[in-house]
């Protein structure tokens, strides 16, 4: 039985040209996190394996930085970066947990962080 929950940074906004940290946190489970995949729609951005470190997809290597922790930093944001991002936690023995973050990249300087929220 999967008892864990993923807490994410929720709905966030950032300025064009700026950077943003995407972060998720798995709680309420003793399952071991073996790997976290970061994806945007159907594209793989990065993988963080607990022991083997990071893989950054070459199409994002100039604009994505590993961390902090299991999170991912997106840099040089463009309006095209607006959309859904997913953290996919591969755990043992529970299986897979997925968290969702919606990022809106704004032209103006009024971007503010949204509230955190949890999804089971």
């Amino acid at each position: 039985m999967m008892t864990g929950t993923i807490e994410t940074t929720g709905n966030i906004s950032a300025e064009k040209g700026g950077s943003i940290i995407l972060q998720c946190h798995l709680s309420s489970t003793t399952a071991q996190v073996t790997q976290v995949n970061w994806e945007q729609q159907d594209q793989l951005l990065a993988i963080c394996n607990a022991d083997l470190g990071w893989h950054i997809s070459p199409s994002f290597k100039d604009r994505v930085a590993p961390g902090p922790g299991l999170g991912l930093t997106l840099q040089s944001l463009t309006v095209n970066d607006t959309g859904e991002y997913f953290c996919i936690y591969h755990t043992y023995p529970d299986g897979t947990y997925t968290g969702r973050i919606f990022l809106e990249v704004l032209e103006s300087s009024v971007a503010e962080h949204g509230a955190r929220f949890q999804i089971p």
């Epitope: 995949n37 022991d51 083997l52 893989h55």
Partner: antibody
Framework: QVQLVQSGAEVKKPGASVKVSCKTS????????MHWVRQAPGQGLEWMGG????????TYNQKFQGRVTLTVDKSSSTAYMELSRLRSDDTVVYYC????????????WGQGTLVTVSS | DIVMTQSPDSLAVSLGERATINCKAS??????VAWYQQKPGQPPKLLIY???YRYTGVPDRFSGSGSGTDFTLTISSLQAEDVAVYYC?????????FGGGTKVEIK
């Protein structure tokens, strides 16, 4: 230039253990994870696991869990793969291979070590 | 475990002709796929990574495409030195797995 030089061929009896070494040079050993891939004669490739030389952290293919142990000696930039409780179907070529930086692809490989398990 | 199924098992192509090798993953692996070339008595060599990126020094007659579950390696104009076995490889999730290989020969 980058080099991965493996130890020589071994002949072992069933139930024994074998330890294959992979001596590296030409790059920063602790900055790239090292993996082991094996290949039966005329057959395909099988990933056994990998080790982060900096932390000693390992990820194993569950198929070999409990039988394979990956270690490193940072002072000599050498990686080791030990396989225990050998069976006849472990008669294969074992390769060490390093990953690209920040990418899960093998860019350099050792020359391979043939381990023969025979009574 | 993710199963990578290659087809065909072997392929005979005339010099200068196109060779196409397919690889099907048992589940979606996005673009987390590489292609390796192995010649007899040698370790594999990286040709293509992230499904479509040619590795340094690899001739441009080699190209890769695909995402999700279906991937293709194409040799646009087969040369004698391309005779080898080709393997696809996924690293989307451990255990990392390889296809069974496709042997390419000259017709």
């Amino acid at each position: 230039q980058v080099q991965l030089v493996q130890s020589g061929a071994e002949v072992k009896k069933p139930g024994a253990s074998v330890k294959v070494s992979c001596k590296t040079s030409g790059y920063a050993f602790t900055e790239y994870t090292m993996h082991w891939v094996r290949q039966a004669p005329g057959q395909g490739l099988e990933w056994m696991g990998g080790i982060n030389p900096n932390t000693g952290g390992t990820t194993y293919n569950q198929k070999f869990q409990g039988r394979v142990t990956l270690t490193v000696d940072k002072s000599s930039s050498t990686a080791y793969m030990e396989l225990s409780r050998l069976r006849s179907d472990d008669t294969v070529v074992y390769y060490c291979a390093k990953l690209l930086r920040l990418m899960y692809y093998f860019d350099y490989w050792g020359q391979g070590t043939l381990v023969t398990v025979s009574s | 475990d993710i199963v990578m199924t290659q087809s065909p098992d072997s392929l005979a192509v005339s010099l200068g002709e196109r060779a196409t090798i397919n690889c099907k993953a048992s589940q979606d692996v996005r673009t987390a796929v590489a292609w390796y070339q192995q010649k007899p008595g040698q370790p594999p060599k990286l040709l293509i990574y992230s499904a479509s990126y040619r590795y340094t020094g690899v001739p441009d007659r080699f190209s890769g495409s695909g995402s999700g579950t279906d991937f293709t390696l194409t040799i646009s104009s087969l040369q004698a030195e391309d005779v080898a076995v080709y393997y696809c490889h996924q690293h989307y999730i451990t255990p990392w797995t390889f296809g069974g290989g496709t042997k390419v020969e000259i017709k």
